[in-house]
Structure formats: C-alpha cells, structure tokens
C-alpha cells in the first residue's frame, strides 16, 4: 500500500503522458487523478512504465472502481492486465469481443493464464453460449481450447459455431469431448456433398457411431490413417473387412503397420481370417 | 531368399500399348502389395500406382489412371502392370518394387531389376 | 499428394568431404521417409528408413533426421563408391511421392 503524500507543486498530472515515467511511485500516487487515468488508459501502453509504477496504476483504478472495472476501462488495459488477478477478473462484465481480443492480445504466445482462463469464462457465461465469432477468436490464440472444456461445457455449443473449429483445435480432445461435438457437427455439416461433408466431418470422427461409419465406407471418402485410429474401438468393431477395405480406399495398405494398435488389433480379432486375407496385408486374426 | 524379376526389354510404336511383368519369389505373395514405380531417361522416380495382390485391387496415380491397367496372377506370384496409348514420353525404365511395412504406409524394400520400355516411330 | 522437393539437383564433392542432401516435404510427414541410392542402369537401394534407421550393410557414414516438413541425408565422408543419385521417399500418404534426386560426382 503506498501511503498518501500531498503532490508537489507543479507536478499535478494534466494528462497521461511519458513524463510520467520521470515519477516515483508515491508521486505517481498522489499526482495522477484516478478518474483521468481512467479515460486516457489507451495510453497507459504507449508509456514504458516499470512494473512498480503499473502496480500504482492498478491501485488507482481498484479504488476508483471496487466493484470492478468498466468495459471502456477493460478494453484499453493492455499490458495492465497482466497485473490483474482472477478475483480481479470476476468483477467484470466483459460483452464485447472486441475487449476479449483486445486482453487475449496481450497474453499472446503464453500459455492460458488463471487470468485468462477466468476472462474467457465470464466473457462466455456472459453471452450464454459460445457463439461462432467467440469460438474464432478464441481458438485462434488457443488452439486447445476447446478441448479444456468439459464435456458437459461443450454440450452448450450451438451447432452453427462448429464451422469455426479447425482441425488442430481437436488434437487434444478426448473420446468424451468428440461425443459431444461429433452430432453436433454432422448437423452444423448436414447439406454438404460428399467429399466437402468428410472434409470437415473428419477431425470429429473420433465421436462417430458405427452407423455413420457404415454410411461413409459406402462414399468414396478414403479416410486416412491417424483418422482411423482415432476413432471409437466400439464404432469400428462390428465393421466388416470389405466396409473397412472401402472406407480407407488406399489407406488400407498401412493397416498392417498398426496391426498392434488399438482399434486395429481389437477389429482384426473380430474378423474371419479368409475376409482378412483379401486386404493382402498378411494379417493374423 | 526374396526376388522380383521383371520381363524383358520392349520396343514399341506410338498409341500401342505394354504389359510388364513381375515375378515374385522368396515370400507370400498375397501378403505384400504390389507397387509399380517408373524412371524416363535422366529423369527421377515416379510412383504409378499399386495393386492388392490378394483382391486385385488397385490404386493409381491420378497421372496414369486412364492409360494404366495393374494386375495380379496369384497362382503364378506375378503382377502385371499394362501401359496404353503409348507416347514417346512414356520411354523410361518401369521398375515393380515390394513395400515393408514397419511403419506407415511402407517403404520399399524390394525392387525388381528394371524393364526397359522404348516408345519410337 | 505430398510434394517432395529435393536440393541440391547435383553437387561435386571431394573424397573424404561431408555431403548433406535435403529433402522438404509440403506438409508434416512425421519421421515417414526413405532413402535410396541408385547407380547407373541399377535399380534403386535402399539406405534409411523412418528418416534415421540405417538398413543392415549400410556403412555408418550414411545418416538422416529431420521430422515433420524438413529432413537431411548426410555421407559423412564421401568414398568413391557413393558417386550415384540419391533419392527422398514419402510414405506418410499410400500415394507414394519422391524427391527430384541428387546427383553426388567426385570432384
């Protein structure tokens, strides 16, 4: 806590400036006015100021507002956020995207901090689903994101923000997580053709039923291995060797080399060794 | 002791066609499929496609896929691959070679000794 | 299909030289590539494989690494022997693609 001191004479701030990084914390304290650093914090970021002098700053701010910042204060923070604690953060009431990429700017290149983590939730609980622009913007500075919720979180994801998700923000999703996000996406997907529809069906597969993947075998889709093998061991066992044979097309050929891996190895104990034999791969079942 | 040995040299004219043979030894032919992989002269290799010895199913590079025919004779171990509508670009060496499959899709381990095909008026 | 791009086309080294031959794959193909030597009216031979594995009879003074996109073939001291084109292999796609080749001459 800095304590209160009177403000030299002369050195009343007029407006937030670089002349202020010439000040000691406490002249910091007793010379610049709560409520003008408050509508000038767009500049706060363009002033180099130490760490010390931001943590002035944030106190100024605190006592200006204990119940927690206004947005027009939130979305000019910048660097000043990073001061911030998740108590801080759950005072707020983030509504506009443009804040949230304005803070998750800041964190950029970083791990989700527990600050980030907190913004992202209120800002979320705040909209009341994660809506499409959210969903964008979020996993495009975390591509993981989607894969920390939980299952029952995602299960408030509207159909229409799965045409945001790419491929990689599934790499770290769980059997659980693709069981929620699959149906949701074979509705966000529903009228496309063929091969555009596997295109974009094809990283939530790991939460498809065996029906759906009866239905593909018959559509040409020549799914690739890593796909294959992310699916559900359930979905793929009452497969047959000829479904198996043309839902991979060419990509049958590399079944032999995970012939150990579930859910190859579960499958092929499940099929008749004369069906295996036409693969002419040599596998054992 | 595995072997693949491939016909011999063909000459042939323009918009005729070619069958190249493949004769495996030394492993169970059913258990590997069946690559074919061509070099024109001075040029680099070219994966054409590849054959399921088992069901005689094939697969091609989208390059060759209207002029090129793979096929298997299990009860002799040869794989054939026929070539049509020749041009003189098609003058290379067409090699068969067999994948193993330690890892992926399978590198070639094995390769025939190489079937030379000239195309000339 | 994955392009492979092979550098350099050719290169002229003396005995006992480090050669280093690269080969850049247009998306991530894991550790999944081969390498082959090839002489003059011979069939292509297989040196490495899975980027690092040396095939059994291959001299220690071949080597790779390299995953995902970028990868290296290296003769660590080039013998009068290694004059032939080398060769990058994808098997990461059953479409099977390989590099444009490298021609080693002796200086």
């Known amino acids: 806590e800095v304590e209160k001191t009177a403000c030299p004479s002369g050195k009343k701030a007029r407006e937030i400036d670089e002349s202020l990084i010439f000040y000691k914390k406490w002249e910091l304290e007793a010379c610049v006015d709560a409520a003008l650093l408050a509508t000038q914090m767009d500049r706060v970021n363009a002033i180099p100021f130490t760490y010390e002098q931001l943590d002035v700053l944030k106190h100024k701010l605190d006592e200006l507002y204990p119940q927690g910042y206004p947005e027009s204060v939130i979305q000019h923070l910048g660097y000043l956020f990073l001061k911030m604690s998740p108590e801080d953060i759950r005072k707020w009431n983030v509504t506009s995207l443009e804040t949230l990429k304005a803070l998750l700017e800041v964190n950029k290149g970083h791990e989700m901090s527990p600050q980030v983590a907190t913004l992202i939730d209120r800002f979320v609980k705040g909209r009341g689903q994660l809506d499409k622009d959210t969903l964008d913007t979020l996993t495009a500075f975390y591509p993981g994101y989607l894969c920390s919720l939980s299952p029952e979180e995602l299960s408030s994801v509207p159909p229409s923000s799965i045409w945001a998700v790419r491929p990689q923000d599934l790499d770290t999703c769980d059997p659980r997580q693709l069981d929620v996000l699959y149906p949701k996406a074979r509705l966000a997907f529903q009228n496309m053709n063929g091969s555009e529809y596997f295109v974009k069906i094809q990283s939530f597969l790991g939460g498809a039923p065996t029906e759906d993947l009866k239905a593909l075998s018959q559509q040409n889709v020549s799914m690739d291995l890593a796909t294959f093998m992310k699916l559900r061991t359930d979905a793929v066992l009452p497969l047959t060797v000829a479904e198996v044979q043309k839902l991979l097309g060419p990509h049958v050929e590399g079944l032999k080399a995970e012939e150990r891996h579930r859910p190859v190895r579960d499958w092929i104990l499940r099929q008749r060794q004369d069906d295996l034999d036409t693969l002419g791969l040599g596998l054992q079942g | 002791e595995v072997q693949l040995v491939q016909s011999g040299a063909e000459v042939k004219k323009p918009g005729a066609s070619v069958k190249v043979s493949c004769k495996a030894s030394g492993y169970t032919f059913t258990n590997y499929w069946m690559h074919w992989v061509r070099q024109a002269p001075g040029q680099g290799l070219e994966w054409m496609g590849n054959i399921n010895p088992s069901n005689g199913g094939p697969y091609y590079n989208e390059r060759f896929r209207s002029r090129v025919t793979m096929t298997v004779d299990k009860s002799t171990s040869t794989a054939y691959m026929e070539l049509s509508s020749l041009r003189s670009e098609d003058t290379a060496v067409y090699y068969c070679a067999r994948p193993y499959y330690g890892s992926s899709y399978g590198y070639f381990d094995y390769w025939g000794q190489g079937t030379t095909v000239t195309v000339s008026s | 299909d994955i392009q492979m791009t092979q550098s350099p086309s050719s290169l002229s080294a003396s005995v006992g030289d480090r050669v280093t031959i690269t080969c850049k794959a247009s998306q991530d193909i894991n550790k999944y590539i081969a390498w082959y030597q090839q002489k003059p009216g011979k069939a292509p031979k297989l040196l490495i494989h899975?980027?690092?594995e040396l095939q059994p009879g291959v001299p220690s003074r071949f080597s790779g690494s390299g995953s995902g996109t970028d990868f290296t073939f290296t003769i660590s001291s080039l013998q009068p022997e290694d004059i032939a084109t080398y060769y990058c292999?994808?098997?990461?796609?059953?479409?099977?693609?390989f590099g444009g080749g490298t021609k080693v001459e002796i200086k």
């Open positions: 292999l994808q098997y990461a796609n059953p479409l099977r693609t």
């Open positions: 899975y980027t690092s």
